[in-house]
Amino acid sequence: LEDGYKVEVGKNAYLPCSYTLPTSGTLVPVCWGKGACPVFECGNVVLRTDERDVNYWTSRYWLNGDFRKGDVSLTIENVTLADSGIYCCRIQIPGIMNDEKFNLKLVIKPAKVTPAPTRQRDFTAAFPRMLTTRGHGPAETQTLGSLPDINLTQISTLANELRDSRLANDLRDSGATIRIG
């Protein structure tokens, strides 16, 4: 679990989870639940897939990844402090006790007050460990590279959301310097 995934109130949280499709290409059922993975199934299910569809989900939860390719990464929209906690991603591989279980810790931080905009074209010194988690960021971060100026507060609040390599390219194209890893 380490330090978990930190997201500000009001932002979208992203929790990565994926599996390799069997050689048959058949999808494996997956469930996401609030709380640590129990022995079987998921507790407090927020989203579930079967061999073909996403067959259950609740209002603010959706799959950011392409589940048809085994990417079952979860997005939680517009998080509140109540969303903090452990989330279980369970890959329900057929057979007895074959399931893969992943417990992911989500930490929700209070929203920061935005100070006056500051010009900053080189993020590396200020945020040397940006973009360390694989996966895809939420939609609202994907056009960041098209903005002519990005202030430090925007960067710090988005730091936990910037996960898409395409976004890294956008930022690079905008003149920013980024170090990944």
């Epitope: 290409g25 959706w62 799959l63 589940f67 990417d71 395409r166």
Partner: antibody, heavy 121, light 107 residues
Framework: QVQLQESGPGLVKPSETLSLTCTVS??????????WNWIRQPPGKGLEWIGY???????NYNPSLKSRVTISLDTSKNQFSLKLSSVTAADTAVYYC?????????????WGQGTLVTVSS | EIVLTQSPATLSLSPGERATLSCRAS??????LAWYQQKPGQAPRLLIY???NRATGIPARFSGSGSGTDFTLTISSLEPEDFAVYYC?????????FGQGTKLEIK
Amino acid sequence: QVQLQESGPGLVKPSETLSLTCTVSGGSFSRGGYYWNWIRQPPGKGLEWIGYIYYSGSTNYNPSLKSRVTISLDTSKNQFSLKLSSVTAADTAVYYCARDHYSSSWTFDYWGQGTLVTVSS
Amino acid sequence: EIVLTQSPATLSLSPGERATLSCRASQSVSSYLAWYQQKPGQAPRLLIYDASNRATGIPARFSGSGSGTDFTLTISSLEPEDFAVYYCQQRSNWPPTFGQGTKLEIK
């Protein structure tokens, strides 16, 4: 109400690349759940699924066309695009963009009106 | 790739009559079959999904049945606007495939 609208050249020369764009309005384009597809229909014939792109940028193509197809996404413009390279007369068809949702995968609930692309010199 | 065979290729009926269209799959598609209606110059419109569920806004005169390899689309009493081409489509196996269509024409 979701609307999809195809646009692009109606005439393409053999061996060149066919390029079409689908503009989506009135729907949740920039969020997960929806897959954005291209489907074609040669004159007087049936329908053929070409491929999809997901919100995340993930793509999947029909094996029969995979080597020639590229589908891309521009979330800032609510658009996705199709490129089909090395076209021949057999690629003459009405090209449709269509949507499906992951709760009923591969069930195409919204379609564009279609655009006829003729491959001819 | 699953092949869907529709029959008949053309069906000639009069308004008010009952229409029965068939779709046969080369292997089982369970109940993962949809039906679409296409009028000249228009895009296909989803009528039925998963063999028997009517899509939003589709009149009750349209119904679907079947499972496995044999499916039927029934229009209980034909209205003038129902004359069109009908396609079946499977989503059981990738890639999704369509039938070649049945043309429903006015007798």
